[in-house]
């Protein structure tokens, strides 16, 4: 048993049929010595008396809010949550496996630049009685500070009968230098509590590996005289690290016809303009990637050819 | 030692070209190592991230773009600060810092070159003959060092008397390649920045 926060405790249980469970001793936080009784949740049934209560925790029915009273007055509470371990593996029932970039990916994180700010998100099918708390640090043995906000529900997605909820959190490394060479990874820890079930999820990464720039901005076309060619120009996204001559991007320009079957023309360039042939009903798209460290491409910015 | 002249002249451009070749070569070599040594801990997640230049050179700090010198987090480990007379930079100071930057890059390359050559000598003794260092990568390191044009004492190749542990050598190769790739990214950024200014 360990304390998650004040008056909230997590009991770690090996979860298999007829498991013996864990013996837990609760102590009433009071100077009083006699006349103390214990109840669980909303029930008025007295579970025991005295300053301490010894219980055998085996299943979710044994978890919940234990309250000690004296003469009708509440003295203190202890909330017991369960953390299940099945076949030596901690349960991951609350969050959905996103399977990207690999199986058992519950948390995904992205950064728009090298400022030390990043966003993590996760999915669940659970809609109520759910709380998350997020902690993060740079390195684990001698951790350096990363500050995370509160996790918020950002989206609901419905696919037929299935509803999933997306939560996200923003974190900022306390003293980040965009030019630094990372040698210790960022660690992100998410505590998830659904009703009386506790689970924790972790992710470890270097900012350089989770970079995904915003799409290029101000995508414009300029037709070239007496030609089917156009000059496409764009700018670095506002959110990208500066100076741009140090934090350079490379770009992919794509011309795509209306039908998916039509051949796509692709050009790669380090410049912020390119000359392409604009076909009728086609669209021109541009995306960006760090020029020197191949992390993710941005989403596409697109304009119609016409 | 000859300090390079700090005027962004056409002489900077070959360095940019060589640094791009360097990044390409080390990235290819790392990819090859990850594929060939697939049953060894050779991915970014599996290895310890060591920097053989730590406490010996200060490339990131010495080559910091001017725009980032206002960032306290970038300055806290610097012995030499760009900032003089408030936020004004004297041109002599700028050229001195650029010389410091380029000489630091040169020292990095020299250190990695020695390590890689020593390692290759060990790998050539491996009866499995599983992996060797790409000669192109070693040549590119050499070309960039020549383009940087420093006169420096030659560091003798480390020789080891004991029997090499090939498993450890291959893991060390992965660690070195990961670290060198990160440093090659920094060098490329620096050359691009200097070329633009």
């Amino acid at each position: 048993i360990w304390e998650l926060k004040k008056d909230v405790y997590v009991v770690e249980l090996d979860w298999y049929p007829d498991a013996p469970g864990e013996m837990v001793v609760l102590t009433c936080d009071t100077p009083e010595e006699d006349g103390i009784t214990w109840t669980l949740d909303q029930s008025s049934e007295v579970l025991g008396s005295g300053k301490t209560l010894t219980i055998q925790v085996k299943e979710f029915g044994d978890a919940g809010q234990y309250t000690c009273h004296k003469g009708g007055e509440v003295l203190s509470h202890s909330l017991l949550l369960l953390h299940k371990k099945e076949d030596g593996i901690w349960s991951t029932d609350i969050l959905k496996d996103q399977k990207e970039p690999k199986n058992k990916t519950f948390l995904r994180c992205e950064a728009k630049n090298y400022s030390g700010r990043f966003t993590c998100w996760w999915l669940t099918t659970i809609s109520t009685d759910l709380t998350f708390s997020v902690k993060s640090s740079r390195g684990s043995s001698d951790p350096q500070g990363v500050t995370c906000g509160a996790a918020t529900l950002s989206a609901e997605r419905v696919r037929g009968d299935n509803k999933e909820y997306e939560y996200s959190v923003e974190c900022q490394e306390d003293s980040a230098c965009p030019a630094a060479e990372e040698s210790l990874p960022i660690e992100v820890m998410v505590d998830a509590v659904h009703k009386l079930k506790y689970e924790n999820y972790t992710s470890s990464f270097f900012i350089r590996d989770i970079i995904k720039p915003d799409p290029p901005k101000n995508l414009q076309l300029k037709p070239l005289k007496n030609s089917r060619q156009v000059e496409v120009s764009w700018e670095y996204p506002d959110t990208w690290s500066t100076p741009h001559s140090y934090f350079s991007l490379t770009f992919c320009v794509q011309v795509q016809g209306k039908s998916k079957r039509e051949k796509k023309d692709r050009v790669f360039t380090d410049k912020t303009s390119a000359t392409v042939i604009c076909r009728k009903n086609a669209s021109i798209s541009v995306r960006a990637q760090d020029r020197y460290y191949s992390s993710s491409w941005s989403e596409w910015a697109s304009v119609p050819c016409s | 030692r000859n300090l390079p002249v700090a005027t962004p002249d056409p002489g900077m451009f070959p360095c940019l070209h060589h640094s791009q070749n360097l990044l390409r070569a080390v990235s290819n070599m790392l990819q090859k190592a990850r594929q060939t040594l697939e049953f060894y801990p050779c991915t970014s997640e599996e290895i310890d991230h060591e920097d053989i230049t730590k406490d010996k050179t200060s490339t990131v700090e010495a080559c910091l773009p001017l725009e980032l010198t206002k960032n306290e987090s970038c300055l806290n480990s610097r012995e030499t600060s760009f900032i003089t007379n408030g936020s004004c930079l004297a041109s002599r100071k700028t050229s001195f810092m650029m010389a410091l930057c380029l000489s630091s890059i040169y020292e990095d390359l020299k250190m990695y070159q020695v390590e890689f050559k020593t390692m290759n000598a060990k790998l050539l003794m491996d009866p499995k003959r599983q992996i060797f260092l790409d000669q192109n990568m070693l040549a590119v390191i050499d070309e960039l060092m020549q383009a940087l044009n420093f006169n420096s004492e030659t560091v003798p190749q480390k020789s080891s008397l004991e029997e090499p542990d090939f498993y450890k050598t291959k893991i060390k190769l992965c660690i070195l390649l990961h670290a060198f790739r990160i440093r090659a990214v920094t060098i490329d950024r620096v050359m691009s920045y200097l070329n633009a200014s």
Epitope: E100, R108, W121, S154, R157, E166, Q254, Q256, S283, S285 | -
Partner: nanobody, 117 residues
Framework: QVQLVESGGGLVQPGGSLRLSCAAS????????MGWYRQAPGKQREIVAT???????NIADSVKGRFIISRDFVKNTVALQMNSLKPEDTAVYYC???????????WGPGTQVTVSS
């Protein structure tokens, strides 16, 4: 091309809530991304929230924790639940969709949201 129709705009007091809805029609299979942008008088159109068929929802910092985007992949609808509204949320809200990652955006005609006491 996709046709988009918004509904649910109106006048609301500061601190109040509104729900905007948008339905897509036309020759569509699965739409890659749907979402909402807004344009306040004299300002540029800005992102509010967009949600792709997979990957991360993009929510503007200014509305994080107050607005929730909901998307139904079968009905091809998107909704925006706006809570704790502020006067600075006053704008014309536009529904937005892209059939594929590289296709050009389609826009609805817009719906006015006014937050005022």
């Amino acid at each position: 091309q996709v046709q988009l129709v918004e509904s649910g705009g109106g006048l609301v007091q500061p601190g109040g809530s509104l729900r905007l809805s948008c339905a897509a029609s036309g020759s569509i299979a699965e739409i890659y991304v749907m979402g909402w942008y807004r344009q306040a008088p004299g300002k540029q159109r800005e992102i509010v929230a967009t949600t792709p068929s997979s990957g991360r929802t993009n929510i503007a910092d200014s509305v994080k924790g107050r607005f929730i985007i909901s998307r139904d992949f079968v009905k091809n609808t998107v909704a925006l639940q706006m809570n704790s509204l502020k006067p600075e949320d006053t704008a014309v809200y536009y529904c937005y969709a892209r059939l594929t990652p590289t296709s050009v955006a389609s826009w609805g005609p817009g719906t006015q949201v006014t937050v005022s006491s």
